[in-house]
């Protein structure tokens, strides 16, 4: 009786079990009664990234400097080329097909994590006792100067986005 | 695959004036575009750039002198208040690093 | 802000022969540099990005070299459609959130 079901690794064709092609190959042709699957590896700048029945591999992803893009990993017959943005640029989404500008955190606010060419900037609000006056893509929230180390009083508080002001302590007559 | 300026004029000084880089055969949301400039017989000098997000960065010699900002095919870049400094042909150029597809340019003249 | 010094400013070369135009960034810019060709009256044309790479279209006669701070462009068997101003420009990001295209200021190539 033919079989219905097939074990990992093989596909049903014409009433009987055909060993799939590893990845890097491609289908040629399927097995027979009497021959196995035959396949090929794949070309220059293709890939297969399973074990498949597919007759043809697929192109690797294509970096486009003009978007800019560039190669993080190149491709091999069983993996596609990974991308990644150039400097400065991030990846608009997981796929990697276009960038932008990494974002500055403005004053008020401090960078909790510098961006890569993969992720944007992340920035957070200075809590009270910390401030940053500037956009920055890479400065954090920096604390409000200690009046009191320097022997000096708070003349006028911070807020986050300026730093406290010190000045003298009344002396007494 | 093409960009176009329009907008450039004879103008006084101070007047604003806005230049349109219009796009065609490719999309601004995926698509960075410049601003570059030649003053007559001059080099070329950079002015902005907008990502397909919108995001915006500027040469550090601007200082709010001119805005960047688009729509879905075109790219504005407006100057705020114009000295006779900035007459120049202005260009829009696509790229990230670099500056694959230029406009012919658009003439702006501030003269009193 | 990058300074890009180009040299020569001007360069007079025999129809076959060779012409070497240097750039120089005021920091390391890895690759981070362009080549553009310039006649008059039309916009600069994209021949060399990322300091070697040929630009679509471009002759194999134009040659970019360099990384960090010196950079050269080579143009052989000189033809008369050469002529031109050539420009190079640089792409550098401060990490900041500080972006910078800078060029330099240009060589004028006659072909004799």
């Known amino acids: 009786e033919p079989p219905t079901a097939c074990r990992e690794k093989q596909y049903l064709i014409n009433s009987q079990c055909c060993s799939l092609c590893q990845p890097g190959q491609k289908l040629v042709s399927d097995c027979t009664e009497f021959t196995e699957t035959e396949c090929l590896p794949c070309g220059e700048s293709e890939f297969l990234d399973t074990w498949n029945r597919e007759t043809h591999c697929h192109q690797h992803k294509y970096c486009d400097p003009n978007l800019g893009l560039r190669v993080q990993q190149k491709g091999t017959s069983e993996t596609d080329t990974i991308c990644t943005c150039e400097e400065g640029w991030h990846c608009t989404s997981e796929a990697c097909e276009s960038c932008v500008l990494h974002r500055s955190c403005s004053p008020g606010f401090g960078v909790k994590q510098i961006a890569t060419g993969v992720s944007d900037t992340i920035c957070e609000p200075c809590p009270v006792g910390f401030f940053s006056n500037v956009s920055s893509a890479f400065e954090k929230c920096h604390p409000w100067t200690s009046c009191e180390t320097k022997d000096l009083v708070v003349q006028q508080a911070g807020t986050n986005k300026t730093d406290v002001v010190c000045g003298p302590q009344d002396r007494l007559r | 695959q093409s960009v176009e300026e329009s907008g450039g004029r004879l103008i006084t000084p101070g007047t604003p004036l806005t230049l349109t880089c219009t796009v065609s055969?490719?999309?601004?949301?995926?698509?960075?575009v410049s601003w570059v400039r030649q003053a007559p017989g001059k080099g070329l000098e950079w002015i902005g750039i907008i990502d397909s997000g919108g995001g915006t960065a500027y040469a550090s010699w601007v200082k709010g002198r001119f805005t960047i900002s688009k729509t879905s095919t075109t790219v504005d870049l407006k100057i705020t208040s114009p000295t006779t400094e900035d007459t120049a042909t202005y260009f829009c150029a696509r790229g990230v690093t670099f500056f694959g597809l230029w406009g012919p340019g658009t003439l702006v003249t501030v003269s009193s | 802000d990058i300074v890009m010094t180009q040299t020569p400013a001007s360069v007079e070369a025999a129809v076959g022969g060779t012409v070497t135009i240097k750039c120089q960034a005021s920091?390391?810019?890895?690759?981070?540099l362009s080549w553009y060709q310039q006649k008059p009256g039309q916009p600069p044309k994209l021949l060399i990005y990322?300091?070697?790479d040929l630009a679509s279209g471009v002759p194999s006669r134009f040659k970019g070299s360099g990384s960090g701070t010196e950079f050269t462009l080579t143009i052989s068997d000189l033809e008369c459609a050469d002529a031109a101003t050539y420009y190079c420009?640089?792409?550098?990001?401060?990490?900041?959130?500080?972006?910078?295209?800078?060029f330099g200021g240009g060589t004028e190539v006659v072909v004799k």
């Open positions: 420009q640089a792409y550098y990001y401060s990490g900041g959130g500080s972006y910078d295209y800078a």
């Open positions: 055969g490719f999309s601004l949301s995926t698509y960075a």
């Open positions: 990322r300091a070697s």
């Open positions: 920091q390391s810019i890895s690759n981070y």
